[in-house]
Amino acid sequence: SEVEYRAEVGQNAYLPCFYTPAAPGNLVPVCWGKGACPVFECGNVVLRTDERDVNYWTSRYWLNGDFRKGDVSLTIENVTLADSGIYCCRIQIPGIMNDEKFNLKLVIKPAKVTPAPTRQRDFTAAFPRMLTTRGHGPAETQTLGSLPDINLTQISTLANELRDSRLANDLRDSGATIRIG
C-alpha cells in the first residue's frame, strides 16, 4: 500500500520523491498530481518539470530541494484538510512504460483548539464545514470546522504542537518533514 505522510493543518507538508540523473544536468521530466498515478501522465497536475526547469506549478505547491540533482520532493504550503489524499510523483523516464510512479498518502491532522465551555447535546441544529481547520463544537464533541455561533479560541502555535509527543512521533515515524515559515 502507499506510504503515509502526516502534517497538521496550517503547517507545510513534505512529500519526498527522488531520482538520480544519469549525468549532471541530464534531467528527466517529472509531474506531481492529485489522485493515484494513472497509466500515463499525472491526473490533476499541481506541478511539472521538464528537462531544464519547473515549467508549471500552482499556488502553494513548490519544490524546495535541488531538483537539478533529482530531489523533486513536493512541499505544500499551509495545508488544510482539503489537501488530504493520494499524491502521484511520476518520473517520466524516456522509453515505453519506463516511468517510475510513486503514490504518496498525505494525511492532514486537524489542529488543536481549546473547547468552548458549552453542552454536548446543543450540537444538533447544523454541522460545520469539514474542509477547514478543525475546531471544537460543544465540549467533548470535536468537529472539523465551526458553526457561526461557536467561538473558537486561538489555534495553538506550531511550536506548541511540536511539543505534543504523539504528533512528534507521528512525524518521525512517517518520515515527514515539517518546515516552519
Partner: antibody
C-alpha cells in the same frame, strides 16, 4: 494489512438494544476516525456517526443522535456501536469503516453485521 | 441534512459503453464528494474522493467530475466487472449518501 473484523449476526426483539463490535488490525484506531454506516435491504447507505478514538469525541447524524452510542477501546483496537429502541426499520447490515485520516471518505470497510429485528 | 440525489436507480449498459452516473446535492458542497462501488455480497469500495481524485488501485476508466451541486461518475469502456451498485457521498456536512444506481447488462 488493514482489516476490520466485525461481530456476528444478531437477531433481536423490537424495543431491545444491540451492541456491535469492530476489531481493527494493521493500524492504530487512535490515528483515524472510525465510522458506522448501515444499509437496509436493497437500499442505499446511511451514515450513523463517527468516533475519534484518541479522545472519544463523537459525531452522529441527528436521526440517530438519541439512539446510537459509538465507543472505542484503544487497548483492544476495537470500535463499538450500540443502538437502542430497535424497530423493524433497523433491520440492516451495519458496517464499520475507517476513513482516510480525519476526512470522511471511507477507505476500509468491515464485512458487515446483519441485524434482524423481529418479534 | 444535505440530500444527495441519484436520479437513475437502474441503468442498462453493455460492455464497452461509456456510462455516466449523476448525483445532485441539495446545496453547495464544493468538491467534498466521494464515489463508492458495491458488488453483491461485498462491502462498498472507495473509487473517487474530492469529486475527481482516483483512489489507489482504481482503474483509469473511472473518472469523477463536478463541483458545487452537480457531480458525475463516468465509466469509460464499461467492463463486466463494473456491474455493481454505485453511491455518491458528500462530506461537506455530516456525511450523507445518495440512494444508489445499479448498473445492469442490457
Amino acid at each position: 494489512e488493514v482489516q476490520l473484523q466485525q461481530s456476528g449476526a444478531e437477531v433481536v426483539r423490537p424495543g431491545a438494544l444491540v451492541k456491535l463490535s469492530c476489531k481493527a488490525s494493521g493500524f492504530n484506531i487512535k490515528d483515524y476516525y472510525m465510522h458506522w454506516v448501515r444499509q437496509r435491504p436493497e437500499q442505499g447507505l446511511e451514515w450513523i456517526g463517527w468516533i475519534d478514538p484518541e479522545n472519544d469525541n463523537t459525531i452522529y447524524d441527528p436521526k440517530f443522535q438519541d439512539r446510537a452510542s459509538i465507543t472505542a477501546d484503544t487497548s483492544s483496537n476495537t470500535a463499538y456501536l450500540q443502538l437502542s429502541s430497535l424497530t423493524s426499520e433497523d433491520t440492516a447490515v451495519y458496517y464499520c469503516a475507517r476513513d482516510f485520516g480525519y476526512v470522511a471518505w471511507l477507505v476500509y470497510w468491515g464485512q458487515g453485521t446483519l441485524v434482524t429485528v423481529s418479534a | 441534512d444535505i440530500v444527495m440525489t441519484q436520479s437513475q436507480e437502474f441503468m442498462s449498459t453493455s460492455v464497452g459503453d461509456r456510462v455516466s452516473i449523476t448525483c445532485k446535492a441539495s446545496q453547495n458542497v464544493d468538491t467534498a464528494v466521494a464515489w463508492y462501488q458495491q458488488k453483491p455480497g461485498q462491502s462498498p469500495k472507495l473509487l473517487i474522493y474530492s469529486a475527481s481524485n482516483r483512489y489507489t488501485g482504481v482503474p483509469d476508466r473511472f473518472t469523477g467530475t463536478g463541483s458545487g451541486t452537480d457531480f458525475t461518475l463516468t465509466i469509460n469502456n464499461m467492463q463486466s466487472e463494473d456491474l455493481a451498485d454505485y453511491f455518491c457521498q458528500q462530506y461537506s456536512s455530516y456525511p450523507t449518501f445518495g440512494g444508489r444506481t445499479k448498473l445492469e447488462i442490457k
